[in-house]
Amino acid sequence: MLSHTGPSRFALFLLCSMETLLSSHMAPTHQLPPSDVRKIILELQPLSRGLLEDYQKKETGVPESNRTLLLCLTSDSQPPRLNSSAILPYFRAIRPLSDKNIIDKIIEQLDKLKFQHEPETEISVPADTFECKSFILTILQQFSACLESVFKSLNSGPQ
């Protein structure tokens, strides 16, 4: 595992950006029906999984980061919905460093889930090559896990 002693500027930046995301959550202006959300999730799952598996093959031995936390589920809806506004900046940030075609398809689907007028913060990718790879891997893993959470929730009755 990657271990870090003391706070880094990158870690502090992430914490600040996450606080901004949480505090700037605006009221939705439209709500997609669960059937449409499900279609989008089904579109995203193979894209996300393929991207993750390709990256793991290409970057063997890169550990996941303990410092990167993708707040990918909203905290105010039942069933859970993807927090598209929180996720999109990460994919825009890693787009130049990964498979642009697949990421463009993911961004296209996430845009459909995004509520109007929701602000997006800008995300900086770490400059250090190793930290950067770890950052990308963690985003892809957490995004895949979030899709699975939403998928299972949509398959289940009310909890």
Epitope: M1, I41, L42, E43, L44, Q45, P46, R49, L52, E64, S65, N66, L69, L71, C72, L73, T74, S75, P80, T138, Q141, Q142, S144, A145, C146, E148, S149, F151, K152, S153, N155, S156, Q159
Partner: antibody, heavy 118, light 113 residues
Framework: EVKLVESGGGLVKPGGSLKLSCAAS????????MSWVRQIPEKRLEWVAT????????YSADSVKGRFTISRDNARNTLYLQMSSLRSEDTAVYYC???????????WGQGTLVTVSA | DIVMSQSPSSLSVSAGDKVTMSCKSS????????????LAWYQQKPWQPPKLLIY???TRESGVPDRFTGSGSGTDFTLTISSVQAEDLAVYYC?????????FGGGTKLEIK
Amino acid sequence: EVKLVESGGGLVKPGGSLKLSCAASGFAFSSYDMSWVRQIPEKRLEWVATITSGGGYTYSADSVKGRFTISRDNARNTLYLQMSSLRSEDTAVYYCARQNWVVGLAYWGQGTLVTVSA
Amino acid sequence: DIVMSQSPSSLSVSAGDKVTMSCKSSQSLLNSGNQKNYLAWYQQKPWQPPKLLIYGASTRESGVPDRFTGSGSGTDFTLTISSVQAEDLAVYYCQNDYSYPYTFGGGTKLEIK
């Protein structure tokens, strides 16, 4: 190395309460959904509850709904199960488990025994 | 809730034998989006916690010997052990990972003659 260590089990009277903990190490705890699964000795496995990676959503079996609460502290890498109004049928070994990326519970703790008896 | 049924409940075989066990779900576990079946197989040896053997119905977890093979799709699944070893003595469970509540089969107890 991924490690999950449960604690907090023991003997409790019907109607009593108990809080189980699961200390996680060797992986990015905050990235994974976590679950509790129980097993009555020599019997089948029964899923108890799951909590999403950020802790915002929880799911639980009908048999424990309203009595058991799953929670997590990502800063402490710890999963919890608060059990109240315990019944004799809650007697079991309780395992904490980490969700695989797609399908299955990839890692399990050794379990902690909860015995509900007068 | 999805009901998981396993058969047989127990079987006794000799070392080197080929073994198959079945798991049926009351509804399809196939995700049409990623074409994955949300079914997992676990091995539980005496006095140990369960261990993930197979996920996605057919993908072996890393470190699992290749004598273990998972197959099937939708509602019918099979776990095959091509040549049983003494250390395979265990109870094998299948699990629905498609929706909450997660449900497990009753298990197949494998005994070595």
